[in-house]
Structure formats: structure tokens, C-alpha cells
């Protein structure tokens, strides 16, 4: 249950996540299974641990193995194994279905391909993309921070697309390439727990008091239509329309959207002339359909304005 | 939603044991830890111990070790807390609970009606 | 095992006070979590990792503090706020409560 499948490329960077959480607070330990031997964690180590993190800078295919974490809470010690494959490079331009991460579906009106697992990684902008091993070129495609936009899809738009960037360890620079397939047709649907994309739990957002400020919430629910799916904020555990303070809006109505094809629903959190008072307020994006609900907290802290006197 | 019903009210003799069930529904029952707390009357909250029922794993207050068993029913999704030995101080209301989301251990948000055990001779 | 001390024990107070409850561990601890007992009911967990409200707890209840020191603020105290309240840490084993502190209305 608590397994999770990895893999990358040989010489490239490869960062996997236990697939255990905690608080940050809790120590995590990482071993080889077949040796039981310790992950190091100082990070001279070409293989290291960091917390909830295994990196492998770079990955060679002798690293190839289960990998188990251990999260030591007060009560127990919660186990976790990364199954980690790590292949040699291909020479031609086909990328094998053992290196496709999940097929995601885009329609006429939205299609945004998300790159795989790239939220574990320390990368900067610009973000490569690739289709059928070609650079994509032209205004329809879109780089837009980790994902890419195509506008005005159409069934050729289908095919195997790879983001490209670099991953930053102190000071060194590792590549990293992820590929999924793409089509582009109606899915059969269904409905999983909600998983918030936006914004990361216990987000520390920062506002300009005077200035307005927009918060959005993000999560998805399944393929397809979804019965029942919500996104909503609320303000120190209350609903916003019963907190009372006019400044905080949620944007009425709720955004679908498809991404790794699968349904998700956006509501923006709109703040008006921030003030000293919002920053003590608690923000929880909550997302909930049949399966449950989840929920992440986001606070919110000053930012000096820069001072562009000399 | 999720639910947490416990067994019924107990009386008990000094020296013996009680096993309190709680049966769980509304979430996966191995997705979840589950604690157990005690309330003896007029007194404060006291942990007594946890079971993990995917691995049947257990953690104790020391307290208690030696004391209590723990074990859970994966089949019904029923967890037990059996206390032996029982004597008078014992007497107490007995919860089971468990987090909001188990990894991160962000403090008991359900529970159960809990069960009153009266050790009496 | 990490002992909790909460403080004052009782207090009396009026609706619409600003009401504030202490907790002092005899270690440091990462977070602290704080519940609402009722005469014969469950605990109601209102505050999670110091100072994270529960869901649909109202917005008068607060939490703050760090290391050895935690507080837990009412801030404008309404007459269905009478119970009992603890504060409990998850940062070692034993899990522990403080002894509770009981609210009652002026």
C-alpha cells in the first residue's frame, strides 16, 4: 500500500519521495532493502538522503533496487519503499512504455500537460518540451511554469511529450527528462479522493499590505464529470460568506479545468487592500467530494515592498 | 463520514479484564492508526497505547504496558483494548480515536461515544 | 515523559471576555493540540499543530506559542464556549494531556 514505482535515466537526476509523510520535525530514515544498508545523508554522496527526499545525483543503473523509509513518529515507526528502476539511455528517439509516466487527455478548450514529479526538484525556468523528440515550436505552445499549454488542440496534437530541465544541488547542475503520452479524446470518467495541487500545505504566502491579493485553490477529483466535487476556502475554520469582512471574496463560480487528465476545480480567494489583520487569519483550501475531504493551510506574511530610492 | 462506535458499559471485579471494541466506517480502516485515551471520573485525558491495523504493530503509554493488549480485526474494522488486572482506579470512560490525517499526526479529531467501565467488588 | 501544566485550573468569566489558557510543557515540543470537553461528551478537537483551526470551528478560537510555551485564546466568549479544556502534546511517547481547565459563565 505504501509502495511507490520510480525511475529515470542513467546519468540524469533522480529524486524520489517516501511515500510516507510526517511533520517536518520527524526523522526519516532510508535504506537499501536487499542489504538493509543506511542511505547516507551527507550530501558529498553521489546517493543521499534528505528527509523525506532519496536523491540520486546522478542515478546509475546499479542503483537500481527497493528502497525502504522509515518516518520515526512518537507512536510508530511508519515504513515506506520507493521501488526505484533506474535505465540506460536509448540511443534512438522512441522512449519505451516503461519510462511513459501516467497518459493524460486534453480537449479543444483545455489541454495542459503537466511534467512529471518536477515539483521534487530545485529547477528554474525555462522548461524544454518535446514531442516525438522534436523541440516544439510555434505560438500554440505555451511553456507556462511546470506545465505545458497547447491552444486549439486538435487528434494530431496526440503523441509522447518530454519536458526537459535542470536540476540545481548546491551549485551543480543535473538534467532531468520526463516523458508522458498526450491524446486527445473523451475518457471514461472516475472519481478518487481529492488531491490539492495549489497550494502546498502550510504555504507561507507573501502580501504587500495596501495592495490586493489572490489566493487560488487547487485540486482535482477524477476523470471526467464529476458528481460531486467542490473547492472552497475558508477563514479561521469559517465558510467566507460567514466570516463577514467584504475585502475577502471567493471568485464566484468554480474553474474546470483537465490537467494529467484529470478533472480539477479552482476557486480564487480574492483580498482586497490587504491589511495588518489578514496576516493573522488562517487560510484553508479545502476540496472535498464523495471519497472525503482534504484540506491545506496557507498563511499569509509581509512583503517589504522594495525601495527603489537611492 | 467517518464513524467510531465503541462497545457498551462494563462492570467489572477487581483482578479481572474487560475488552472494549470500536468499530470503525466512513474511511479505510488500515489507512488509519487508532488510539486509545482514558477519562477517569471527574479527572483529565490519559493515552493509554495505539495499534496500527495494517501491521498490527502497537505503541504503549509504559504506564500501561504489560497491562493492556491492543489488536484489531481487519475483517470488521474493529479495533480492541483489552485492560487485565483491573483495579478500582481503573475505573474511567475509554475511548478509542484517531487523527485527521495519520502522518501527520495532527491531533484526535474523531471519536467514539466511549464506554464506561466501572471495576467495583 | 513530557509533563503538561496548564493554568489557571478553573476561571470564571463573562460572555463577550477575551479568554486565554496556558499550557507549559516541561520540555520544548513541536506542536501542540488543544479539545473542548462537554459534561458527558467526547472531546472536540479545535486547535491542531499550535494554532491550525479545525474544520468548522469558529474563528473566535486561536493558538499560539512555541517550544515550552503554548496559549489558547477565546476571544469574545459565548455562553456554549462552558467546558472544559485541554491541551496535548505529540512530540514524544507518552502521549500527554494537561490536567484541563474548567470555564465557567459570571
Known amino acids: 500500500k505504501f509502495s511507490k514505482q520510480s525511475w529515470g535515466l542513467e546519468n540524469e537526476a533522480l529524486i524520489v519521495r517516501c511515500p510516507r509523510q510526517g511533520k517536518p520535525s520527524y526523522t526519516v530514515d532510508w535504506y537499501y532493502s536487499q542489504t538493509n544498508k543506511s542511505i547516507p545523508t551527507q550530501e558529498r554522496n553521489r546517493v543521499f538522503a534528505s528527509g523525506q527526499l532519496l536523491k540520486f545525483l546522478p542515478a546509475a543503473v546499479a542503483d537500481s533496487g527497493i528502497y525502504t523509509c522509515i518516518v520515526r513518529s512518537p507512536t510508530f515507526n511508519r515504513t515506506g519503499y520507493a521501488n526505484v528502476t533506474i535505465y540506460k539511455k536509448q540511443s534512438d528517439c522512441n522512449v519505451p512504455d516503461y519510462l511513459m509516466y501516467s497518459t493524460v487527455s486534453g480537449s479543444e478548450k483545455n489541454s495542459k500537460i503537466y511534467c512529471p514529479t518536477i515539483d521534487l526538484y530545485n529547477w528554474t525556468a525555462p522548461l524544454e518540451w518535446f514531442k516525438n523528440c522534436q523541440a516544439l515550436q510555434g505560438s500554440r505552445y505555451r511553456a507556462h511554469k511546470s506545465f505545458l499549454v497547447i491552444d486549439n488542440v486538435m487528434t494530431e496534437d496526440a503523441g509522447d511529450y518530454t519536458c526537459k530541465f535542470i536540476h540545481n544541488e548546491n551549485g551543480a547542475n543535473y538534467s532531468v527528462t520526463a516523458t508522458r503520452s498526450f491524446t486527445v479524446k473523451d475518457e471514461q470518467g472516475f472519481s478518487l479522493f481529492p488531491v490539492i495541487g495549489a497550494p502546498a500545505q502550510n504555504e507561507i504566502k507573501e502580501v504587500e499590505i495596501g495592495k490586493n491579493a489572490n489566493l487560488t485553490c487547487s485540486a482535482c477529483f477524477g476523470k471526467g464529470t464529476q458528481f460531486l466535487a467542490a473547492v472552497l476556502w475558508q477563514l479561521n475554520g469559517t465558510k467566507i460568506t460567514d466570516f463577514g469582512e467584504p475585502r475577502i471574496q471567493q471568485e464566484e463560480g468554480q474553474n474546470q479545468s483537465f490537467s494529467n487528465g484529470l478533472a480539477c476545480l479552482d476557486m480564487v480567494l480574492r483580498i482586497a487592500d490587504v491589511k495588518e489583520e489578514d496576516l493573522l487569519l488562517q487560510y484553508d483550501c479545502l476540496a472535498l467530494n464523495l471519497h472525503g475531504l482534504r484540506r491545506h493551510t496557507v498563511r499569509l506574511s509581509r512583503k517589504n515592498p522594495i525601495d527603489h530610492h537611492s | 463520514q467517518v464513524q467510531l462506535v465503541q462497545s457498551g458499559a462494563e462492570v467489572k471485579k477487581p483482578g479481572a479484564s474487560v475488552k472494549v471494541s470500536c468499530k470503525a466506517s466512513?474511511?479505510?480502516?488500515?489507512?488509519?492508526?487508532m488510539y486509545w485515551v482514558r477519562q477517569a471520573p471527574g479527572q483529565g485525558l490519559e493515552w493509554m497505547g495505539a495499534i496500527d491495523p495494517e501491521t498490527g504493530d502497537t505503541a504503549f503509554n509504559q504506564k500501561f504496558k504489560g497491562r493492556v493488549t491492543m489488536t484489531a480485526d481487519k475483517s470488521t474494522s474493529t479495533a480492541y483494548m483489552e485492560l487485565s488486572s483491573l483495579r478500582s482506579e481503573d475505573t474511567a470512560v475509554y475511548y478509542c480515536?484517531?487523527?485527521?490525517?495519520?502522518?501527520?499526526?495532527?491531533?484526535?479529531?474523531?471519536w467514539g461515544q466511549g464506554t464506561m467501565v466501572t471495576v467495583s467488588s | 515523559d513530557i509533563q503538561m501544566t496548564q493554568s489557571p485550573s478553573s476561571l470564571s468569566a463573562s460572555v463577550g471576555d477575551r479568554v486565554t489558557i496556558t499550557c507549559s510543557a516541561s520540555s520544548s515540543v513541536n506542536y501542540m493540540h488543544w479539545y473542548q470537553q462537554k459534561p458527558g461528551k467526547a472531546p472536540k478537537l479545535l486547535i491542531y499543530?499550535?494554532?491550525k483551526l479545525a474544520s468548522g470551528v469558529p474563528s473566535r478560537f486561536s493558538g499560539s506559542g512555541s517550544g515550552t510555551d503554548f496559549t489558547f485564546t477565546i476571544s469574545s466568549l459565548q455562553p456554549e464556549d462552558i467546558a472544559t479544556y485541554y491541551c496535548?502534546?505529540?512530540?514524544?511517547?507518552?502521549?500527554?494531556f494537561g490536567q484541563g481547565t474548567k470555564l465557567e459563565i459570571k
Open positions: 480515536t484517531r487523527a485527521f490525517d495519520n502522518d501527520n499526526d495532527d491531533g484526535f479529531a474523531y
Open positions: 499543530d499550535t494554532s
Open positions: 496535548q502534546q505529540w512530540s514524544s511517547n507518552p502521549l500527554t
Open positions: 466512513g474511511y479505510t480502516f488500515t489507512d488509519s492508526e
